[in-house]
Amino acid sequence: MRRGPRSLRGRDAPAPTPCVPAECFDLLVRHCVACGLLRTPRPKPAGASSPAPRTALQPQESVGAGAGEAALPLPGLL
């Protein structure tokens, strides 16, 4: 059985190493990748009831409560 690279998951997962510029933290495999490798979904319409953008963790973001909630259109925006 081939497995993906996720050996440490959930509450045992280590905090990610900050990504270098032009890289974004892929939440599903828990490592930094080129932002261009991550899919760009359609934008949410203005006035939608849930304003949080669908992002990966940006290079500048810390990991903790609210991680992944970047409001700026940074390069890692998915």
Partner: antibody, heavy 117, light 111 residues
Framework: EVQLVESGGGLVQPGGSLRLSCAAS????????WNWVRQAPGKGLEWVGY???????YYNPSLKSRFTISRDTSKNTLYLQMNSLRAEDTAVYYC???????????WGQGTLVTVSS | DIQMTQSPSSLSASVGDRVTITCRAS??????????MHWYQQKPGKAPKLLIY???DLESGVPSRFSGSGSGTDFTLTISSLQPEDFATYYC?????????FGQGTKVEIK
């Protein structure tokens, strides 16, 4: 907008093989995560596995290595090779792509695979 | 594997009713301050449709009568005022740990 179209389903005998295709348009399969999900008649959803931007695959261990996900980036098409098929593999097979957290926001229409003698 | 248990398995309700479906994970699906929990709607013969992602975020184009809440192991999908087109089966899904798993589904039927 992403569009996904599955094909290749049909009737196959137990022990046989089948390859399903999922043609994607609206985005490149070299970006993000591309999944197969199945649903047996009258039953719930079961995640089969994915292939991601790097070509990394991960499978539901319950499938015991009988299924293989691959891709042809020149055709922007995802494949599911199914071997040693059993009656319990009878299901509608969907391809779907995900948001950053694994939520599947685009789905194909599904293709029915029937394993029966 | 993380087991997802939905309740109830089915329910009967009327148009205008407030409907609540719960999903309990066998272990926490939170990581990095995010709940890796999602909700889908499926109608007979159709592919599932994403309603809520990341426990509480409404997918684009989904009516605001749908909402999600919860964290850790306990999650809720609420339909504030059931409409005729909402009669369907609803599934929760976790993507915190491999393999990704779905709940068994909750069928919402007309009373």
């Amino acid at each position: 907008e992403v569009q996904l179209v599955e094909s290749g389903g049909g009737l196959v005998q137990p022990g046989g093989s089948l390859r399903l295709s999922c043609a994607a348009s609206g985005d490149s399969i070299t970006r993000g995560y591309w999944n197969w999900v199945r649903q047996a008649p009258g039953k719930g959803l079961e995640w089969v596995g994915y292939i991601n931007y790097s070509g990394t695959t991960y499978y539901n261990p319950s499938l015991k290595s009988r299924f293989t996900i691959s891709r042809d980036t020149s055709k922007n098409t995802l494949y599911l090779q199914m071997n040693s098929l059993r009656a319990e593999d009878t299901a509608v097979y969907y391809c779907a792509t995900t948001l950053p957290y694994g939520a599947m926001d685009y789905w194909g229409q599904g293709t029915l695979v029937t394993v029966s003698s | 594997d993380i087991q997802m248990t939905q309740s109830p398995s089915s329910l009967s309700a009327s148009v205008g009713d407030r409907v609540t479906i719960t999903c309990r994970a066998s272990e926490s699906v939170d990581d990095y301050g995010i709940s890796f929990m999602h909700w889908y709607q499926q109608k007979p013969g159709k592919a599932p449709k994403l309603l809520i992602y990341r426990a509480s975020d409404l997918e684009s184009g989904v009516p605001s009568r749908f909402s999600g809440s919860g964290s850790g192991t306990d999650f809720t999908l609420t339909i504030s005022s059931l409409q005729p087109e909402d009669f369907a089966t609803y599934y929760c899904q976790q993507t915190s740990k491999d393999p990704w798993t779905f709940g068994q589904g909750t069928k919402v039927e007309i009373k």
